[in-house]
Interface confidence: low
């Protein structure tokens, strides 16, 4: 670590007086300090000696000596007052710049450290400091503003008692820039629009930044319009708007407008697109099926897009049977808007009932008139079955009912034993009916079919069941023919 | 600075079709954003919005009230208008008109009531 | 209709007590939630604006949060001007509508 001579942290002196300062270190060494007049330098080798036969107030500062070869940097300082009566100050630079939320040092270095008891920070012609404004003084180097704010942007004066009297520093102009994270924020609005042809329009670009220096205009497809610009200052943000008001729309004003706004840190735009139509336009789509099957007892929601300029003027859901005269509860419709021109309704039918299978319709009214959307909703239901014993055509015949939606399948079996239900150990015989006689089979019913055993004789100590199965389940009913009657069994889902 | 002042009837019969006047100050309902609108308050009892008239004659009403009230706006006088017909003795209120705020950038557009007039008590009596 | 439930509606505080007021909507209305004060003969003051966000000139005592359903206005440090009525309103869908009101009365 270079040394300096003479070897005291501080050295005051008077005015005029002769100043001689020596630094050694083991390689070559440098001197730094604040820019100031009267200085000479010599070195030699090791050693640099900065000297002054007539020091000023504007050689105060402090002088560092520094080992350039030095690998660990070492460094030595002293301290230098030259205490001037008449100047209580030494100011080395008269602007400083900072960002927002640094400290912001003012050099305004103390000439006399006896006077720091009585310094302090002021605005230019004597005003006070902003409140909340956070500083601290070191007489080697100045006052500092901690934290600084875009708002304390001012002109400051260090001031020093001397003799009774407040005695000022020439003013430091201090800058705190704010600082800009990116380009400046967007909005254009709206972010979608149709219009009708003839109809106004009004599209509104607008950017904002912490910073006045940006530049915002509106295009449209490629072509810059020329718009007067509004400014305005509001939540510590500079804002322009840029505002294009169409009284009478055509054709050639639609397509795509482009809000672009720049400033050092890049540029950011946004688009939106304008469609100008010729009429009022309505159309209902939907993403699902519009013939829909459920299981009886589940539930299903029921979803119409709708696209519409203008708005819609009445929208509902109606039930058009073919059961009860039942409409579908208005708190079971919701509707979403996706934005201006498109919205999502949907009718939620919860828990099914038997009742509430046939067609559901959609109605929705705006100027171009009304348009409708109908779901047909069929009801699933696991297969229902009887059988009974009968003669046709003098055969003794059993003949098993069964119905559900989809239609059922029908299989016969012959078992051992008295049972409610045929187990595989105990099967004898199987029949598959491919084809049962369909009995009934109209819209949002079940389907009823009909499948024919013929027996000459029923074995006494055997079962006869016929089981029918669906995609949502099966059911069966077991004939025993020693009893009076037979067992059945209820759907199996 | 912003002001806002109803005037109409202290006193109306039933049946009978109040119309009351806000003229206001300070901004113009020609501004993008812009908008005023009609709130009234029964005695002792909580704020209740009855319509909102916007700079561009987008007009919206309170559904229980609908089919009674009307809102206009008259931009070379600074007045919006409320007529509300078929006055009943529950119409008694203070009816107060106040402005929406204007759309500020970039922010989303401030939508609520920021200035309000005084109010004007109604009776409705026989 | 949105309703919009303000609880509870009358409460005692004392001057420096920190207060609380709750809103709930009867659907999800994002933050599109005002605050306002009223003194008995006056017409209401907009405190908070779109849940949180507190309007010009209003003392930093008051502040707004929540989102979706449940609102809340807190008052820190309460202050003898303190003592009104405050109402909720929003402004997510047609028909605007108010909370019932909290009375702030001196315990």
């Known amino acids: 670590i270079p040394v300096i001579e003479p070897s005291v942290p501080e050295l005051v002196v008077k005015p005029g007086a002769t100043v001689t300062l020596r630094c050694v270190g083991n390689g070559s060494v440098e001197w730094d300090g604040p820019p100031s007049p009267h200085w000479t330098l010599y070195s030699d080798g090791s050693s640099s000696i900065l000297s002054t036969n007539n020091a000023t107030f504007q050689n105060t500062g402090t002088y560092r000596c520094t080992e350039p070869g030095d690998p660990l940097g070492g460094s030595a300082a002293i301290h230098l007052y030259v205490k001037d009566p008449a100047r209580p100050w030494n100011v080395l630079a008269q602007e400083v710049v900072v960002f927002e939320d640094q400290d912001a040092l003012l050099p305004c270095l103390l000439t006399d450290p006896v006077l720091e008891a009585g310094v302090s920070l002021v605005r230019v012609r004597g005003r006070p400091l902003m409140r909340h404004t956070n500083y601290s003084f070191s007489p080697w180097h100045g006052f500092t503003i901690h934290r600084a704010k875009f708002i304390q942007s001012q002109d400051y004066q260090c001031s020093a008692l001397m003799g009774g009297r407040k005695v000022m520093s020439i003013s430091i102009r201090l800058k705190v820039q704010k600082v800009i994270p990116g380009p400046p924020a967007l909005t254009l609005v709206p972010a979608e629009l149709v219009r009708i042809r003839g109809e106004a329009a009004q599209i509104v670009c607008s950017a904002s930044s912490v910073d006045v220096n940006f530049d915002v205009f509106l295009q449209h497809n490629n072509t810059k319009l020329a718009i007067p610009q509004q400014s305005d200052f509001h939540n510590n943000r500079y804002q322009k708007v840029l505002t294009l008001n169409l009284d009478q729309v055509d054709f050639q004003h639609a397509g795509n407008y482009s809000c672009v706004a720049s400033n050092v840190q890049g540029k950011h735009s946004t688009s939106m697109f304008f469609r100008v139509v010729e009429s009022a336009y309505l159309n209902l789509s939907s993403e699902q099926n519009l013939i829909q099957e459920v299981t009886v007892g589940e539930g299903l929601n029921l979803k119409v897009m709708v696209e519409a300029y203008p708005g819609l003027q009445g929208f509902n859901w109606t039930y058009l049977g073919p059961f009860s005269d039942h409409q579908p509860e208005p708190k079971l419709a919701n509707a979403t808007t996706k934005d201006t021109y498109r919205h999502t309704f949907t009718l939620s039918l919860p828990r099914l009932k038997p009742s509430e299978a046939g067609r559901y319709s959609f109605l929705a009214r705006n100027p171009g008139g009304w348009r409708a959307l109908t779901f047909e909703l069929t009801l699933r239901y696991p297969p229902e079955v009887s059988v009974i014993w009968t003669f046709i055509n003098g055969s003794g015949t059993l003949l098993c009912a069964a119905s559900g939606y989809p239609q059922p399948n029908v299989t016969w079996l012959q078992c051992s034993g008295h049972t409610d239900r045929c187990d595989e150990a105990q099967v004898l015989q199987v029949w598959d009916d491919p084809y049962p006689e369909v009995l009934s089979q109209e819209p949002f019913h079940k389907v009823t079919v009909q499948s024919l055993l013929t027996v000459e004789t029923l074995e006494h100590n055997q079962t006869y069941e016929c089981r029918a199965h669906n995609s949502v389940g099966s059911g069966s009913w077991a004939f025993i023919p020693i009893s009076a009657g037979a067992h059945t069994h209820p759907p199996d889902e | 600075e912003v002001t806002l002042k109803e005037s109409g009837p202290a006193l109306v019969k039933p049946t009978q079709t109040l119309t009351l006047t806000c003229t206001f100050s300070?901004?113009?309902?020609?501004?993008?954003?812009?908008?005023v609108g009609w709130i009234r308050q029964p005695p002792g009892k909580a704020l209740e919005w009855l319509a909102n008239i916007w700079w561009d004659d987008d007009k919206y009403y309170n559904p229980s009230l609908k089919n009674r009230l009307t809102i206009s706006k008259d931009t070379s006088k600074n007045q919006v208008v409320l007529t509300m017909t078929n006055m009943d003795p529950v119409d008694t209120a203070t009816y107060y008109c106040?402005?929406?705020?204007?759309?500020?950038?970039?922010?989303?557009?401030?939508?609520?009531?920021?200035?309000w007039g005084q109010g004007t008590m109604v009776t409705v009596s026989s | 209709d949105i309703q919009m439930t303000q609880s509870p509606s009358s409460l005692s505080a004392s001057v420096g007590d920190r207060v609380t007021i709750t809103c709930l909507a009867s659907?999800?209305?994002?933050?599109?939630l005002a605050w306002y004060q009223q003194k008995p003969g006056k017409a209401p003051k907009l405190l908070i604006y779109y849940a949180s966000s507190l309007q010009d000139g209003v003392p930093s005592r008051f502040s707004g949060s929540g989102s979706g359903t449940d609102f809340t206005l807190t008052i820190s440090s309460l202050q003898p001007e303190d003592f009104a009525t405050y109402y909720c309103l929003q402004d997510s869908e047609y028909p605007w509508t108010f909370g019932g009101g909290t009375k702030v009365e001196i315990k």
């Open positions: 659907e999800d209305i994002y933050d599109n």
């Open positions: 300070g901004f113009s309902l020609t501004t993008y954003g812009m908008g």
């Open positions: 106040a402005r929406i705020g204007p759309i500020k950038y970039p922010t989303a557009p401030y939508r609520y009531f920021d200035f």
